[in-house]
């Protein structure tokens, strides 16, 4: 019963981290202009993944799309790859997860198969929020970056009383939802690998076996070190976890005029 | 068609106060900003500020925020400015304008002159 | 504040000659978030509002004469007419539409030669 809870609650986490994973990537507030010198702003401009746009006091929005590849900064792009990575992986996850449920039947899955597919969805899970939580803190750590290299350039002289007022831009929405996301995706995953080790099949003890010696009527019970080996199942499935666990501190270490309503 | 009408001329004494008003019609009124701009007899234009007819929201220069009042009254779609303590130099013509795309003033009402005068 | 300064303060032009009002704006009126130049240009005839024609720096607004062109980014922006026509005779004003307070440009007269 716990296991399924654990399972069924480990699946819930982890559909609501990667729909939080999918809203982060298409949220267009990654980076938010700094109104820290000025809170009321006339034109406030915020930028996403796939998109920059402006808000105007007249309440009128405009975006426009990065309608290049080869232009974008490298940080950029390898952001957007962890996180579609993350999406991908997540929703193969969710996919193989689905059949893993105890809750569900299909056909005469074994339990050791279920326990094989929640141990690879729970991977998976633990490898997409890893993803976003990385991509997150790529773009953040970018921001602050230029955050103060702005901050060291905010008025650029061009001659005379012209100058050119560099706008900074602070974390937008999508950071926090992309790290609440990673993490309950991650979390999602952790449970799902803790349920696996419950799903699989203990090995029953062995029954005791008579051996006959000639001379000497010696019962032996292959138990000693066999019977501790009836855990053997449950230490491989540790050791793929915490390979996963490994895997996890892999992953972590890569860097016309109409009225607008 | 898009109409901002303004009320009549207004003669005041120095230190008293006028209400000007500027009524919408022919679009959507809550979903424009609209603001209201100055111009001296003989003289360039001067922003005094804008507000939000759904929420009554206002951005006001600095140089006007001890003079200006704001408001909105939505049943009539009517915005109104009061200007408080007049004084000579506030003798102008006050017009009022909707906020169009690039925070930028579409249609104009026909402006209020208010002369303030002993 | 944004200060914007136009040139010259007074332009007389012949019937049918191209017309140029500069606008120098004190900061870039360009946001970085669609790219876009936050300068307005207005034409002003005696006894009337303003009357906006351009947006965006170089948007014409709608019904506006194709004559009239928005030009420039950043912080020096230019309104030319490509052949002035006798109704065109009026005061012409810029303004930054990029921070608040929004701020216009002192105004250039137009006259006919």
């Known amino acids: 019963m716990a296991v399924t809870a654990c399972q069924g609650l480990g699946f819930v986490v982890s559909l609501i981290g990667i729909a939080g994973i999918i809203a982060a990537t298409c949220m267009d507030q990654w980076s938010t202009q700094d109104l820290y010198n000025n809170p009321v702003t006339a034109v406030f401009n915020y930028q996403g993944l796939w998109r920059s746009c402006v808000r105007e006091s007249s309440g009128f929005t405009e975006c426009r799309g990065y309608f290049t590849l080869l232009g974008l900064p490298a940080m950029l792009q390898a952001v957007r790859a962890l996180m579609i990575v993350g999406i991908v992986l997540g929703a193969i996850g969710l996919l193989v997860s689905i059949f893993a449920l105890k809750c569900i039947r299909i056909g005469s899955m074994e339990d050791s198969a279920k326990a094989n597919m929640t141990l690879t969805s729970g991977i998976m899970f633990i490898v997409s929020g890893l993803c976003a939580i990385a991509g997150v803190s790529v773009f953040a750590n970018m921001l602050v970056t230029n955050f103060w290299m702005s901050t060291a350039n905010m008025y650029t002289g061009m001659g005379g009383m012209v100058q050119t007022v560099q706008t900074r831009y602070t974390f937008g929405a999508a950071l926090f939802v992309g790290w609440v996301a990673g993490g309950l995706t991650l979390i999602g995953g952790v449970m799902m690998c803790i349920a696996c080790r419950g799903l699989a099949p203990e090995e029953t003890n062995y029954k005791a076996v008579s051996y006959h010696a000639s001379g000497h009527s010696v019962a032996y019970k292959p138990g000693g070190f066999k019977a501790s080996t009836g855990f053997g199942s449950n230490t491989k499935n540790k050791k793929i976890y915490d390979g996963g666990a490994r895997t996890e501190d892999e992953v972590q270490s890569y860097p016309s005029k109409h009225d607008y309503v | 068609q898009v109409q901002l009408v303004q009320s009549g001329a207004e003669v005041k004494k120095p230190g008293a106060s006028v209400k000007v008003s500027c009524k919408a019609s022919g679009y959507s009124f809550t979903n424009y900003w609209v603001n209201w701009v100055r111009q001296a007899p003989g003289q360039g234009l001067e922003w005094i500020g804008m507000v939000h007819p759904s929420g009554s929201e206002t951005r006001l220069n600095q140089q006007f925020k001890d003079k200006v009042t704001l408001t909105v009254d939505t049943s009539t779609s009517t915005v109104y400015m009061e200007l408080s303590s007049l004084r000579s130099e506030d003798t102008a013509v006050y017009y009022c304008?909707?906020?169009?795309?690039?925070?930028?003033?579409?249609?104009w009402g026909q402006g209020t002159l208010v002369t303030v005068s002993s | 504040d944004i200060v914007m300064t136009q040139s010259p303060d007074s332009l007389a032009v012949s019937l049918g000659e191209r017309a140029t009002i500069n606008c120098l704006s004190s900061?870039?009126?360009?946001?970085?978030?669609?790219?876009?130049?936050?300068l307005t240009w207005y034409q002003q005839k005696p006894g009337q509002p303003p009357k906006l024609l351009i947006y965006w720096a170089s948007t014409r607004d709608s019904g506006v004469p194709d004559r009239f062109t928005g030009s420039g980014s950043g912080v020096d922006f230019t309104l030319t007419i490509s052949s002035v026509q006798a109704e065109d005779v009026a005061v012409y004003y810029c303004?930054?539409?990029?921070?608040?307070?929004?701020?216009f440009g002192q105004g250039t007269k137009l006259e006919i030669k």
């Open positions: 303004q930054n539409g990029f921070s608040f307070p929004f701020t």
């Open positions: 304008a909707r906020v169009w795309s690039g925070n930028a003033f579409d249609y």
């Open positions: 900061q870039s009126l360009l946001a970085s978030g669609n790219q876009r130049n936050y």
